[in-house]
């Protein structure tokens, strides 16, 4: 199976406006397993936001094709769920169906592995992407998205689950990583920092971006998320870095303008359908891919991560709105909801483009240490 190669979105990365800035491809020290990352306080080995503990196996699973949307794997961030954090409840995800509070939080007790043993796995997410060490895989074709341009009706559920803000997606959003690798989008959520502190989950050569969007998908080979958890390729997440740009991002504004309505943990609102693909970079051909896990408990592995090389630009005001509007449990701001980067432990990040060829003057010659492990499926 092919290791996802993550393409770094270089801090300079061009926004979805069209600039495509590859994450920096400097020749960094091997991206292997050293987590080398400054994690925000208390985010040590936190749960990945992708594994929505209480959202994945959500009780609110709906009937086929719809259930996807219901499961919100990315019950994100940083908030600590009520309940006895000490009891490692397996269902630390979310106590009940609409209740996205899991018994875990960013940075603090209980340790995630106690909440879900999988969080101590060897192939966890997020990771630091080092373009110079990524394996160029020509077989990685442009991503294909179908049905992502949603009409205003029916409206979608936007919820503050105490860990992140999550948008539940309706049936019909299809995504293909390549031939025979088809998925259905279930939900999307964001990870962010705080005033003056970046909060992306993945990093590029140690650089953390202001924020990151995750669109979680379920393989068409599975009818339910709980069946796909832990299965190689059962879940796939499209991730993109959000950066500050000079203009307001109209697509994101459709969501950000509604955050005030869900300021409280557990609150939700309905928003008109929108073009979900507009929330992602425009270049679907340049990305990094690797196999990892959900970034929040249950931290299930086997998740295929696709990280766009191009970034998405939001205005400074929009980034502030994202980090300053929502509240988590205990009168604490919902911020810094990202997990620390995890060791690669031998995994190779693949790139759909020659990311290791550094165009900057620093590198005398291209350094492409890893080779593409899987040309096909």
């Amino acid at each position: 199976q092919r290791l996802p190669r993550m393409q770094e979105d270089s801090p300079l990365g061009g926004g979805s406006s069209g600039e495509d800035d590859p994450l920096g491809e400097e020749d960094l020290p091997s991206e292997e397993d050293s987590p080398r990352e400054e994690d925000p306080p208390g985010e040590e080995d936190l749960p990945g936001e992708e594994d929505l503990p209480g959202e994945e196996d959500l009780p609110e699973v709906k009937p086929k094709s719809e259930e996807e949307g219901s499961l919100k794997l990315e019950d994100l961030p940083t908030v600590e769920a009520p309940g006895d954090p000490q009891e490692p409840q397996n269902n630390a995800h979310r106590d009940k169906e609409g209740d996205d509070q899991s018994h875990w939080r960013y940075g603090g007790d209980p340790p995630w592995p106690r909440v879900s043993p999988a969080c101590a796995g060897r192939f966890q997410s997020p990771v630091d992407i080092r373009p110079q060490l990524a394996a160029f895989c020509p077989a990685l074709r442009p991503l294909e998205l179908l049905g992502f341009q949603l009409p205003p009706l029916p409206e979608l559920r936007l919820r503050n689950n105490g860990h992140s803000v999550q948008l539940t997606l309706p049936p019909g959003l299809e995504m293909a990583l390549g031939p025979g690798r088809e998925y259905r989008a279930l939900q999307l959520h964001l990870h962010w920092g705080a005033a003056g502190r970046p909060g992306s989950e993945h990093t590029v050569e140690g650089h953390r971006f202001p924020a990151e969007i995750h669109v979680v998908h379920l393989s068409t080979a599975f009818a339910r998320v709980d069946e796909a958890l832990g299965r190689p390729g059962g879940l796939a997440v499209l991730a993109a870095f959000l950066e500050e740009g000079p203009e307001e991002n109209s697509a994101y504004e459709q969501l950000l303008s509604r955050l005030e309505e869900i300021a409280e943990e557990g609150s939700e609102t309905q928003v008109p359908g929108l073009d979900i693909s507009a929330l992602l970079p425009s270049d679907f051909s340049r990305y990094f891919q690797y196999e990892g896990s959900l970034t929040t408990p249950p931290c299930a592995q086997g998740v295929i991560w696709t990280v766009f090389n191009q970034t998405v630009m939001l205005s400074a005001k929009q980034l502030h709105t994202l980090s300053d509007t929502l509240w988590g449990p205990g009168d604490s701001r919902l911020q810094l909801n990202f997990r620390a980067t995890q060791p690669l432990n031998g995994r190779v990040i693949e790139a759909s483009f020659p990311a290791g060829v550094d165009s900057s003057p620093r590198a005398a010659e291209p350094v492409q240490l890893n080779s593409c492990l899987a040309a096909g499926d």
């Epitope: 005033a195 005030e260 604490s332 701001r333």
Partner: antibody
Framework: ELVESGGGLVQPGGSLRLSCAAS????????MSWVRQAPGKGLEWVSG????????YYADSVKGRFTISRDNSKNTLYLQMNSLRAEDTAVYYC??????????????WGQGTLVTVSS | DIQMTQSPSSLSASVGDRVTITCRAS??????LSWYQQKPGKAPKLLIY???NLQSGVPSRFSGSGSGTDFTLTISSLQPEDFAVYYC?????????FGQGTKVEIK
């Protein structure tokens, strides 16, 4: 500009409704708060409301007795005060917060209106 | 609630002096701190927000610094109109809370 009104003398247990008329900015884009200052004392946040009025917050000392509301069509903020106590005596200021939310710095303040609770 | 402690509670200074007021939070508030100036019978006026950002229209002699739990308001050269009471406010946690105030008087 923010202009408060509605203050006055009221007996313990009584009620009063304060208003804050806003002008010169897009009222519906900002969170608003009421902050009070007892004679010779410091500032105490009382209540806040988000820009669209969807979220309201109260200090424990007034919870259940005071109600904050806003009418964006009239560019006006309100504070309904019931079951007033002597310790509620203070100058009440309305303040615009620096964002649509309620817990931010107050970048514009009214001149204040005095509320005196005494028998 | 997060407690904000200002020091000193009062100080006497002369025009032209450099004045420093400190504010300490009972827990980390990142840079969610603002400073206000209040003169007798008047409403508070925002000077600094985000710990170090100068509010529009405020003289550059006012500056703020700090992050986490310790913050400072500095008036580089005290002017006659600066004699007033200064308050810090944290808006990181709920409810927002103010320091008890520091009165700057003429020596």
């Amino acid at each position: 500009e923010l202009v408060e009104s509605g203050g006055g003398l009221v007996q313990p247990g009584g009620s009063l409704r304060l208003s804050c008329a806003a002008s010169g900015f897009t009222f519906s884009s900002y969170g608003m708060s009421w902050v009070r200052q007892a004679p010779g004392k410091g500032l105490e946040w009382v209540s806040g409301i988000s820009s669209l009025g969807s979220t309201t917050y109260y200090a424990d000392s007034v919870k259940g007795r005071f109600t904050i509301s806003r009418d964006n069509s009239k560019n006006t903020l309100y504070l309904q005060m019931n079951s007033l106590r002597a310790e509620d005596t203070a100058v009440y200021y309305c303040a615009r917060t620096g964002s649509p939310g309620t817990f931010m710095h107050g970048d514009h303040w009214g001149q204040g209106t005095l509320v005196t609770v005494s028998s | 609630d997060i407690q904000m402690t200002q020091s000193p509670s009062s100080l006497s200074a002369s025009v032209g002096d450099r004045v420093t007021i400190t504010c300490r939070a009972s827990q980390d508030i990142n840079n969610y701190l603002s400073w206000y100036q209040q003169k007798p019978g008047k409403a508070p006026k925002l000077l600094i927000y985000g710990a170090s950002n100068l509010q529009s229209g405020v003289p550059s002699r006012f500056s703020g610094s700090g992050s986490g739990t310790d913050f400072t308001l500095t008036i580089s050269s005290l002017q006659p109109e600066d004699f007033a009471v200064y308050y810090c406010q944290q808006y990181y946690g709920r409810p927002t809370t103010f320091g008890q105030g520091t009165k700057v008087e003429i020596k």
